[in-house]
Amino acid sequence: AVNGTSQFTCFYNSRANISCVWSQDGALQDTSCQVHAWPDRRRWNQTCELLPVSQASWACNLILGAPDSQKLTTVDIVTLRVLCREGVRWRVMAIQDFKPFENLRLMAPISLQVVHVETHRCNISWEISQASHYFERHLEFEARTLSPGHTWEEAPLLTLKQKQEWICLETLTPDTQYEFQVRVKPLQGEFTTWSPWSQPLAFRTKPAALGKDT
């Protein structure tokens, strides 16, 4: 038997993946657990095996179909259960009625690239991955630039309040190495959260032109 409180949190990537984390502060010894997804009106259900991510939390990804297929919409409710094996039977450890479009977390933006770089500015573009057509243009982005001698946590956040998949970074220092990251969030959903940060894009500004001798 398992004692203690548990937390069961899931997010939908807006296409064909529900990622779940289950935390349990009681001890679970060599117990096999899984997440089971049962939509209210779809003719499929799905299961994934919970794998440990720390001493008291487990995670898994429910793969609902091909990455870009629209497996759930705003009309769906999915019953999500954590099931753990107890001898020959399964015990329900946690349950929630999950509204996918109220619990969104998109995939991190991809394909970051430098479009144009100068001494003091750099134009960068990116793409969103596996994002539903339902959002149309209702997305926002946050970006951050890592300057030499600083940490990511110290980097100021730049907010793009519209679906804009590029940014022009200004007031950069010439001949300097920088890194850049971006993340995305739909405007929809009460419990929607930011995507993970993208993989960092490294770039270097151009050196300043040498002044003429006087």
Partner: antibody, heavy 116, light 107 residues
Framework: QVQLVQSGAEVKKPGASVKVSCKAS????????INWVRQAPGQGLEWMGE????????NHNEKFQGRVTMTRDTSTSTVYMELSSLRSEDTAVYYC?????????WGQGTTVTVSS | DIQMTQSPSSLSASVGDRVTITCKAS??????VAWYQQKPGKAPKSLIY???YRYSGVPSRFSGSGSGTDFTLTISSLQPEDFATYFC?????????FGQGTKLEIK
Amino acid sequence: QVQLVQSGAEVKKPGASVKVSCKASGYTFSRYWINWVRQAPGQGLEWMGEILPGSGSINHNEKFQGRVTMTRDTSTSTVYMELSSLRSEDTAVYYCTRHYGSFDYWGQGTTVTVSS
Amino acid sequence: DIQMTQSPSSLSASVGDRVTITCKASQNVGTDVAWYQQKPGKAPKSLIYSASYRYSGVPSRFSGSGSGTDFTLTISSLQPEDFATYFCHQYSSYPFTFGQGTKLEIK
């Protein structure tokens, strides 16, 4: 086997209300949305709304908001659809249908005639 | 609301013919489209869900395809019992909507 059996034909006067029943059998009643769809004579299909018997959750077509009431009785596995303030344009066959995949099983239909 | 525009509205064909009915959604509906067959005085009968999945008991001559905004119902070889009216239906977002129907008649 899955069956949805609806109540009989009704004749109503304008301004009155009608309550149509849909009794489900052959599956777990609480688990699947029951939708209501109507079809005026010689016309297409029009979605009115849906109810999830287990929770009582309801979604309406805004066109009918305020005029349609959907309820359920889990003890008899029956769903009800009441339409008020009837007018001649509400003359139609009213169907209940289960949503699983799409509308997979349909009731036989209930003819509602609104006439003065 | 999402409009489902079906074409043609009526169609004359013969037994053995291959028939195609199309449905165009006014917005992207993914694959959340179904097809129904209705005969006079009867309730609709479910044929296809999720654009291309046949319900059990539906003959293999019925097939559906499409995604996004363009959908097709194909009857590969018409049988006498196939003469009826066919409706497409989107259940991607509220309110659910139907095409206006295609009446398939004997030539």
